[in-house]
Amino acid sequence: GSTVPPMVNVTCSEVSEGNITVTCRASSFYPRNITLTWRQDGVSLSHNTQQWGDVLPDGNGTYQTWVATRIRQGEEQRFTCYMEHSGNHGTHPVPSGNSHHHHHHHH
């Protein structure tokens, strides 16, 4: 099939002991090979500080996955979710302030 770029959505969890969990979700993409990883100040985080979901079919002939990491509250602006898919790339910030959702469709 033809390439379908992912929708990327970054969300924050509730605060717990000064930490928050930031989750980057990629959905509705094809083919299934995708890079999704967190960066701090532009530098890739180590694998052992991130958690990944499996790349799963979403029932529409496309795929979905996610990656999450825990960060200190107030340092959200230092973190970005990086995506590579089928020769395209994108960088997605953690939403700041009261906005807990950010999504973008790549073309």
């Epitope: 890079t35 694998h47 052992n48 499996d54 790339h89």
Partner: antibody
């Protein structure tokens, strides 16, 4: 068919800088990372750093002050520059494509390597 | 940095033998381990990724296992073309680090 080919100067004088080019084919540099790895004679492999599809870089902190990795997507070339070379930088230098899918990150295709000797 | 140790630097085995190469990490690397084969002329090839996954084109006589800090590569039936050095590599934490290598020779 994915291929990578390194080209370098062969011989570099101590305290001088090293420039190596990795020319790739069969994939787009805009959407895949390329890594640099070296191997001194008779020794093991050492990761130097990488450049991602968007041009951002990660370096081995032990060498970060001397290293620079860049690329030209349109020419399908990745460049390694290392400053202040010493004799212990003598090694075979490899570029390798990085595949990073969730929990999996590996160097799936390697160039043949280029030998660099640091000597006066 | 995480230190990767391959205690056996070289070994001799007969064709058809089962060969096991060990690799240990200085800390838990959560299965974030790859194996590479380097032929005597220098060509490097990915052999195993994420502890036990085989890339396409790699013969099924190669297998990987392990967890925590201890990992191994097994060649179930040694063939002439397996004469090479084998390197483990962790990617749990940046920078990725390699073991010192194990050279496999024919008796």
């Amino acid at each position: 068919q994915v291929q990578l080919k390194e080209s370098g100067p062969g011989l570099v004088a101590p305290s001088q800088s090293l420039s190596i080019t990795c020319t790739v084919s069969g994939f787009s540099l805009n959407g895949q990372g390329v890594n640099w790895v070296r191997q001194p004679p008779g020794k093991g492999l050492e990761w130097l750093g990488m450049i991602w599809g968007d041009g951002s870089t990660d370096y081995n902190s032990a060498l970060k002050s001397r290293l620079s990795i860049s690329k030209d997507n349109s020419r399908s070339q990745v460049f390694l520059k290392m400053n202040s070379l010493q004799t212990d930088d003598t090694a075979r230098y490899y570029c390798a494509r990085g595949a990073h899918y969730g929990k999996r990150w590996y160097f799936d295709v390697w160039g043949a390597g280029t030998t660099v000797t640091v000597s006066s | 940095d995480i230190q990767m140790t391959q205690t056996t630097s070289s070994l001799s085995a007969s064709l058809g033998d089962r060969v096991t190469i060990s690799c240990s990490a200085s800390q838990n690397i959560n299965n974030y381990l790859n194996w590479y084969q380097q032929k005597p002329h220098g060509t490097v090839k990915l052999l195993i990724y994420y502890t036990s996954s085989l890339p396409s084109g790699v013969p099924s006589r190669f297998s990987g296992s392990g967890s925590g800090t201890d990992y191994s590569l097994t060649i179930s039936n040694l063939e002439p073309e397996d004469i090479a050095s084998y390197y483990c590599q962790q990617y749990s934490k940046l920078p990725p680090t390699f073991g010192g290598g194990t050279k496999v020779e024919i008796k």
